[in-house]
């Protein structure tokens, strides 16, 4: 994970966040996991990141993802009150200029070093779901969801006439 | 209508508990992380302790740490501050605050506020 | 804990002036800063949130700066209804949060 040594972690202070153009409206550290309690880890193999989805052993730190929130102008059906309205959208970073990235054409997620202003590629919109849970919907392919297949994040195209609840692509947050 | 409407407040002497509540309507309760906002009289504004949509994670500021519980009940819509072992530096209006977004952690402005609720700890 | 100092304690300024209230941390928040409005009597009115983010149906008179260390609000030309207690909320991670000791807008 990401406490070998040459990768920088995370301090108190976030993300320099005078982005050019859009810029967030929070920000927070978090590690995520699914909703089976499997935590999602990035390891630095052949110079370039891999992302799993794994049991931790209990003595391993999670590794944590700094979420940068943004309002989006397109109005939030799940809000439903009227004040806000706004849906949310998010990009994360395991780690100091590497940022979640949907590969569409390849269904895959991967992290990539970029420079700010992100791709529309590194921007998820967040979806609240039951049991605590959110889920990550690309934005630049609606219906399209982060979700776990075989032990790694991947793409997975969700029919809004289904069931949008559909474990594999329910996620956890926690300090 | 989005509203928050604290209740519970009063006279109450030192060492004495109280516990205030915060009726939430109009919105998905447990999608917000809520807060406790105090204000002494004539004095400016005190965060108190604030809570995760899901109520899995709770903050406290120093002066009220070991001494108040924060607690929300999903199903009845409410926020709860359990006040122990008052202390006359408690004496404040109390409100309820919930955040702008849904985001269910606590790391958010405030958007919404109660009317307030007035604790006076005294002999 | 993180501690805001606002500057001026007291602003006094006629209506039609520029105001300009400062809010510093003490370590940094990144942007996660907010300003409130107080008037007499009232619960705190949500102003700017996301250190430059201005709330839907707040006069575009209003705008914040800053990120880390330093943030302003600043309130372009001054109307009646502005005078009151402005107060900067930091919510960074992780918490205690906390708010400045407020700035008051008085009418010269």
């Known amino acids: 994970a990401f406490g070998i040594s040459g990768v920088p972690k995370y301090t108190r202070a976030l993300h320099d966040s005078s982005i050019t153009g859009i810029s967030p409206i929070t920000e927070s550290l978090a590690s995520l996991s699914t909703y089976n309690d499997q935590s999602i880890t990035f390891a630095l193999e052949d110079e370039s990141y891999e992302i799993y989805v794994e049991d931790l052993k209990k003595d391993k730190k999670k590794d944590k993802v700094l979420l940068s929130y943004y309002e989006s102008q397109h109005p939030s059906s799940e809000s439903g009150d009227g004040v806000d309205g706004k849906m949310l959208m998010v990009t994360l970073s395991p780690t100091k200029d590497f940022w979640l990235q949907a590969n569409n054409k390849e269904h895959s997620v991967e992290l990539h070093k970029c420079e700010k202003p992100l791709p529309d590629q590194a921007f998820f919109v967040l979806h609240n779901r039951s049991f605590n849970c959110v889920s990550f919907e690309c934005k630049t392919d609606p219906g399209v969801f982060i979700g776990v297949k075989d032990n790694h994040l991947a793409l997975i195209k969700v029919d809004y006439s289904e069931n949008l609840g559909s474990e594999n692509i329910l996620f956890k947050l926690s300090e | 209508e989005v509203q928050l409407v604290e209740t519970g407040g009063g006279l109450i002497q030192p060492g004495g508990s109280l516990r205030l509540s915060c009726a939430a309507s109009?919105?998905?309760?447990?999608?917000?992380?809520m807060s406790w906002v105090r204000q002494a009289p004539g004095k400016g504004l005190e965060w108190v302790s604030a809570?995760?949509?899901?109520?899995?994670?709770?903050y406290y500021a120093d002066s009220v740490k070991g001494r108040f519980t924060i607690s929300r009940d999903n199903s009845k819509n409410t926020l709860y501050l359990q006040m122990n072992s008052l202390r006359a530096e408690d004496t404040a209006v109390y409100y309820c605050a919930r955040t702008i977004h849904g985001i269910r952690a606590a790391y958010d402005a405030f958007i919404i506020w109660g009317q307030g609720t007035l604790v006076t700890v005294s002999s | 804990e993180i501690v805001l100092t606002q500057s001026p304690g007291t602003l006094s300024l006629s209506p039609g002036e520029r105001a300009t209230l400062s809010c510093r941390a003490s370590q940094s928040v990144g942007i996660n800063l907010s300003w409130y409005q107080q008037k007499p009597g009232q619960a705190p009115r949500l102003l700017i949130y996301g250190a430059s983010h201005r709330l839907t149906g707040i006069p575009d008179r209003f705008s914040g700066s800053g990120s880390g260390t330093d943030f302003t609000l600043t309130i372009s030309r001054l109307e009646p209804e502005d005078f009151a207690v402005y107060y900067c909320h930091q919510y960074s991670q992780p918490p205690p949060f906390t708010f400045g000791g407020g700035t008051k807008v008085e009418i010269k």
């Open positions: 809570i995760s949509g899901s109520g899995g994670s709770t």
């Open positions: 109009g919105f998905t309760f447990s999608f917000y992380a």
